[in-house]
Amino acid sequence: AVLTQKQKKQHSVLHLVPINATSKDDSDVTEVMWQPALRRGRGLQAQGYGVRIQDAGVYLLYSQVLFQDVTFTMGQVVSREGQGRQETLFRCIRSMPSHPDRAYNSCYSAGVFHLHQGDILSVIIPRARAKLNLSPHGTFLGFVKL
């Protein structure tokens, strides 16, 4: 079968892996700084702790964080900032073992959202100085334009 122009058109993709994670002194939050591992298209721009949406549309978002923390529950929030607002798109929560040798849980979640041009997406861990494993196969963030 002959592919139409629409079928040939490739979806924008951005898969990000962590550079580091930081927590400001006056903050109860840990943020992850990202770098692209796989990129196709120009609709998404990684910038430090966030990803800026250049092309509005419907996206599949996925997020995983690997925690090595004995705090009773850990998890991440995928947050959008746009139109002056900040809002949670989705969150993931895990109970953690209290013993340091066993406190090793990953948290994965995903969803489909309409994102607007200029929106900035980030992964927030609502804990100060959260202990994360920043290996690229344990902690990552991704976008696929549908």
Epitope: S27, D28, V77, S79, R85, Q86
Partner: antibody, heavy 122, light 108 residues
């Protein structure tokens, strides 16, 4: 229990800088999804949003007033500040600060201070 | 910016009557980000309704909100004396956030 309280000079002269302080308790500006905004209301009139600041220090300003406004925070002392430069009589109003409970889809300016009255007069 | 027009500016009503206040937007507003505030003389505004139809904590069940797109309303099923106040609609669908000029609801 969430409370906010505004303080300001009461009266000032045209061309001076208005400095306002919002002191709050019952929440922290170091928490994800929390912000504080400033809104003003001339006597007998409607509400006008001026500026707001988020937990991560991101700041937003009323476009028409942006060149005159500066918002900042002191997280450890639970305070947010607003400065308005070069005031004139049109800035006479009651100034409110309000907590913005962000993070969720159903958030809003859910708690307001009692307001502080500011008169600009020569 | 989105302009919110509230009507009527002033409304007088008797206890027990049904009251509907309207808020018209100059362009479409997402119902998620449409709010109503109540303000009584000498007091600060109180969040009354959020996300178009959800009542804030402590708001009596006689209040309701509805609407979509550019047309929103606040309804009181049976007016009571304590409902006399000004009501402001507010949108944060689009930046900057804006307020309507308000409707003053008086008791006859």
């Amino acid at each position: 229990q969430v409370t906010l309280k505004e303080s300001g000079p009461g009266i000032l002269q045209p061309s001076q800088t208005l400095s306002l302080t919002c002191s709050f308790s019952g929440f922290s500006l170091s928490t994800y999804g929390i912000g504080v905004g400033w809104i003003r209301q001339p006597s007998g009139k409607g509400l006008e949003w001026l500026a707001h600041i988020w937990w991560n220090d991101n700041k937003y300003y009323n476009t028409a007033l942006k060149s005159r406004l500066t918002i900042s925070k002191d997280t450890s002392n639970n305070q947010v500040f607003l400065k308005i430069a070069s005031v004139d009589t049109a800035d006479t109003a009651t100034y409110y600060c309000a907590r913005i409970a962000g993070g969720n889809y159903d958030y809003a300016m859910d708690h307001w201070g009692q307001g502080t009255s500011v008169t600009v007069s020569s | 910016q989105i302009v919110l027009t509230q009507s009527p500016a002033i409304m007088s009503t008797s206890p027990g009557e049904k009251v509907t206040l309207t808020c018209s937007a100059s362009s479409s507003v997402s119902s998620t980000y449409l709010y109503w505030y109540q303000q009584k003389p000498g007091s600060s505004p109180k969040l009354w309704i959020y996300s178009t139809s959800n009542l804030a904590s402590g708001v009596p069940a006689r209040f309701s909100g509805s609407g979509s797109g550019t047309s929103y309303s606040l309804t009181i099923s049976s007016m009571e004396a304590e409902d006399a106040a000004s009501y402001f609609c507010h949108q944060w669908s689009s930046y900057p956030p804006t307020f309507g000029a308000g409707t003053k609801l008086e008791l006859k």
